[in-house]
Amino acid sequence: MNGSEYFVKIQSFLGGAPTEDLKALSQQNVSMDLATFMKLRTDAVLPLTVAEVQKLLGPHVEGLKAEERHRPVRDWILRQRQDDLDTLGLGLQGGIPNGYLVLDLSMQEALSGTPCLLGP
């Protein structure tokens, strides 16, 4: 069974998938469609890297631009380095500026919804 066929079989169960499952899926050439991606749990999407999202979505990654103001894409963008977002070639804005250090302070982030940044 190829990645696409596998994805069709599990698509209906993906809404509650944890980050670990999404990371595993990104290695299986599934080309998740954007509608499915938009229904994923925000907390499961946030830890994914730009490279992982690109692999997870395949050609569907081009659709991120139209969804950049909507969750979970909006929140995910805020967590990524701008340099990494730029590699998607879509003009996505709102990432962490180059030279900033991200402190993973779970309590701070839970309260504010955004990562804590230290300037250069």
Epitope: P59, E62, G63, A66, T87, L88, G89, L90, G91
Partner: antibody
């Protein structure tokens, strides 16, 4: 203003390869993927594939996977499509097109004038 | 892939008249359809996107409609410069597909 410049014509012999160009200007080249479209004489439009100009990653219509190779040169804001093992079936007008990402995956709002490729001995 | 079936393949109408072209998608495309005018020696010209949204500078004689799998495109008050081939494009999927085209002639 946005412009996509393509050479007018290319004449190539059967079995050879050709590299078509599309020079972009008037916008940030790395903020929009570039798409390629084929039109055979008297036929409709057919999507060939696209390329992310920032990291050079292409995606292809399965029909063209072994025929076309998409690349970019960021320094000159130019996209290229190489067509290999040319036959008369490849004689067509080839367009580059830029999408506008207002909704979903984006529709094409800017097009090149097209390059007419003739494959003939 | 999503197939787009466009009809008719050609049509002839009188100046000042009205024509309608249809495109049927092989699956629901959620109104993500655009319409283009194509003249020889030029790149296609975008007329309408998202089913019915007119591009800036395009006359209101051009209109679009539809939902789900069925879409239509109309030109009223036909003018000589409307002679062209018209195409629909679906962009609900990253692998874009066009309709087969409709060649419009004036009687």
């Amino acid at each position: 203003q946005v412009q996509l410049q393509q050479p007018g014509t290319e004449l190539v012999k059967p079995g050879a390869s050709v590299k078509l160009s599309c020079k972009a200007s008037g916008y940030t080249f790395t903020n929009y993927w570039m798409h390629w479209v084929k039109q055979r004489p008297g036929q409709g439009l057919e999507w060939i594939g696209n390329i992310n100009p920032s990291n050079g990653g292409p995606y292809y219509n399965e029909r063209f996977r072994s025929k076309a190779t998409l690349t970019v040169d960021k320094s000159s804001s130019t996209a290229y499509m190489q067509l290999s093992s040319l036959t008369s079936e490849d004689s067509a007008v080839y367009y580059c097109a830029r999408p506008y990402y207002g909704s979903s995956y984006g529709y094409f709002d800017y097009w090149g004038q097209g390059t007419t490729l003739t494959v003939s001995s | 892939d999503i197939q787009m079936t466009q009809s008719p393949s050609s049509l002839s109408a009188s100046l000042g008249g009205k024509v309608t072209i249809t495109c049927k998608a092989s699956q629901d495309i959620n109104k993500y359809i655009a319409w283009y005018q194509h003249k020889p020696g030029k790149g296609p010209r975008l007329l309408i996107h998202y089913t019915s949204e007119l591009q800036p500078g395009i006359p209101s004689r051009f209109s679009g409609n539809g939902s789900g799998r069925d879409y239509s495109f109309s030109i009223s008050n036909l003018e000589p410069e409307d002679i062209a081939t018209y195409y629909c494009l679906q962009y609900a999927n990253p692998l874009r597909t066009f309709g087969g085209g409709t060649k419009l002639e004036i009687k």
